[in-house]
Interface confidence: medium
């Protein structure tokens, strides 16, 4: 049997499309696996073949391209559904081959149903808007290539179930939806419905995305270390447990990596011999500002440990900060009998 480079089932590209709507799906080979495009492959005499495995079946079968009204068709490296049906769900394979070369990849396609308010099991893309930042826009996604530029579709925008018209700070502008000044109250799911004609038929494309209003870069500050601070002293006796929380506030910053770490006498805890554990927790505000807490714990602290320097460090795209914890050994209470004896002039 001839060898074929099989890239397996590409679950990273879990494609979801709505029932009874057009869908155009590009063969992932050219986008993610091969170093050449479809045109190059075609001119080199390679042929692109499509087949599929129905949901809950093991049998690979050819795709029927002879359905009424060309419901499923192929154009270059694109598989078209005009429109999809629920039972089109399955794993689809595109194979590029000639007599000496073969490469193929499979991907899952799920046809999902939506209700009248656009609720569905569809995984929604998230678009982040900065709070109170001036005019920002979202664009109706993934509608390129469905109709030629000569066709003027109608676009209707919804927030949740409600058609957007006469909203205070949200204005539909064709394919774009403009937010004059984004507020927390603008959080939610927004849907654009694009309606266009094709060969005497009318098609609808439904695209829903989640808008999340996040902290504005105008308000962003370097990390703020809330603890340790100058107002708290960790006074311990040898043998006691030492617990020091490092709590840091990070402003939301798009694509910023927030880091918190402890050093003990200038070294990372992993690089020293003390039996130290560090537990981290993270919480977020409504605008995705982040509070990270790392609790440094030494179960049975020694007098040596109490002389060490414990410093919490934090870093974001806005800068780096550090703060030392005030750790000291508890002075033992004076022994009563000795005090009494001294008080009475004993030698």
């Amino acid at each position: 049997s001839e060898r074929c480079d099989d890239w397996g089932l590409d679950t990273m590209r879990q494609i979801q499309v709505f029932e009874d709507e057009p869908a155009r799906i590009k063969c992932p080979l050219f986008e993610h696996f091969l170093k050449f495009n479809y045109s190059t492959a075609h001119s080199a005499g390679l042929t692109l073949i499509w087949y599929w495995t129905r949901q809950d079946r093991d049998l690979e079968e050819p795709i029927n391209f002879r359905l009424p009204e060309n419901r499923i068709s192929k154009e270059k490296d694109v598989l078209w559904f005009r429109p999809t049906l629920l039972n089109d769900t399955g794993n689809y394979t595109c194979m590029l081959r000639n007599t000496t070369y073969c490469s193929k990849v499979a991907f899952p396609l799920e046809v999902v149903q939506k209700d009248s308010c656009f609720n569905s099991p569809m995984k929604l893309p998230v678009h982040k808007l900065y709070i109170e930042y001036g005019i920002q826009r979202i664009t109706c996604p993934n509608v390129d290539g469905y109709f030629p530029s000569s066709v003027k579709p109608t676009i209707t925008w919804y927030m949740g179930c409600y058609k957007i018209q006469n909203f205070n700070n949200v204005i539909p502008e064709g394919m774009n939806l403009s937010f004059l000044i984004a507020l927390i109250s603008n959080n939610g799911n927004y849907t654009c419905v694009v309606t266009y004609p094709e060969n005497g038929r009318t098609f609808h494309l439904t695209r829903t995305l989640t808008v999340k209003v996040v902290g504005s870069p105008k308000n962003a500050v370097p990390p703020v270390i809330h603890s340790p601070n100058d107002h708290v002293v960790y006074e311990k006796e040898p043998g006691e447990e030492l617990l020091i929380p490092c709590t840091v506030y990070f402003s939301f910053l798009m694509d910023s990596r927030n880091e918190v770490w402890w050093t003990i006498d200038g070294k990372k805890p992993d690089d020293i011999t003390i039996d130290v554990t560090i537990n981290e927790s993270i919480s977020h505000s409504r605008t995705e500002d982040e509070t990270r807490t790392q609790i440094l714990s030494i179960k049975k602290v020694t007098s040596e440990d109490l002389k060490r320097s414990y410093v919490c460090h934090a870093r974001s795209a806005k800068g780096e900060v550090a703060k030392a914890a005030k750790v000291k050994q508890k002075v033992p209470a004076p022994r009563y009998t000795v005090e009494l004896a001294c008080g009475f002039g004993a030698t």
């Epitope: 703020v224 603890s227 601070n229 708290v232 006074e235 020091i244 506030y249 807490t293």
Partner: antibody, heavy 123, light 112 residues
């Protein structure tokens, strides 16, 4: 969710002491300051002091210095407020309240409160 | 210690009214970028509830008819359109400088 549950009402004689507890749940207990605020009948709110559970560090309002002791038990996520040498004017509802930190280094608000404990001082 | 003067001490208003409560601190409770002034609502027999923190930030879950403003020494709590559930006592609270917190004496908002 964050909850602060306080101990029940107390009746005490003048000169006695009272110890009120506040059990915290739903957050990392040791990382937030806990405050005590009291309210005499028909009066306003009066801040008494605060404790940082991780270290046991305390700050007391001048008025209560020497009479109030705040402690914590990290194993049960509970803070305690003990007020000694009670007098009739200490009759009040005593609240524990968590201090949250928002984006700034200092100047924090009290974001969660216990349900309050009524302490009555009467001979 | 910073003293807080809240006014008025009581106020009668009707549902739908716009209401303003002010709080004056004896010294500034602001620094670059923020003010350590907070507002609470308290209903009879209940614990206070945080409404506004840092002078103007609305606490999560609090209706947007509540707003706060001011900096330095003078601060305002505004209720844009009074609702029946808003009749309560309101307190301002400063937390400037650790570790001394003080509250205003309260404003009792009653139905006219």
């Amino acid at each position: 969710q964050v909850q602060l549950v306080q101990s029940g009402a107390e009746v005490k004689k003048p000169g006695a002491s009272v110890k009120v507890s506040c059990k915290a749940s739903g957050y990392i207990f040791i990382t937030y300051w806990m405050n005590w605020v009291r309210q005499a009948p028909g009066q306003g709110l009066e801040w008494m002091g605060q404790i940082f559970p991780a270290s046991g560090t305390t700050y007391y309002a001048q008025k209560f210095q020497g009479r109030v002791t705040m402690t914590r038990d990290t194993s049960t996520s509970t803070v305690y407020m003990e007020l000694s040498s009670l007098r009739s004017e200490d009759t009040a509802v005593y609240y524990c309240a968590r201090t949250d930190f928002y984006r700034y280094d200092g100047g924090y608000a009290l974001d969660y409160w216990g349900q309050g404990t009524l302490v009555t001082v009467s001979s | 210690d910073i003293q807080m003067t809240q006014s008025p001490s009581s106020l009668s208003a009707s549902v739908g009214d716009r209401v303003t409560i002010t709080c004056r601190a004896s010294q500034s409770v602001s620094t670059s970028g923020y003010s350590s002034m907070h507002w609470y609502q308290q209903k009879p027999g209940k614990a206070p509830k945080l409404l506004i923190y840092y002078a103007s930030d609305l606490e999560s879950g609090v209706p947007s008819r509540f707003s706060g403003s001011g900096s330095g020494t003078d601060f305002t709590l505004t209720i844009s359109s009074l609702q029946p559930e808003d009749f309560a006592t309101y307190y301002c609270h400063h937390s400037w400088g650790i570790p001394m917190y003080t509250f205003g004496q309260g404003t009792k908002l009653e139905i006219k």
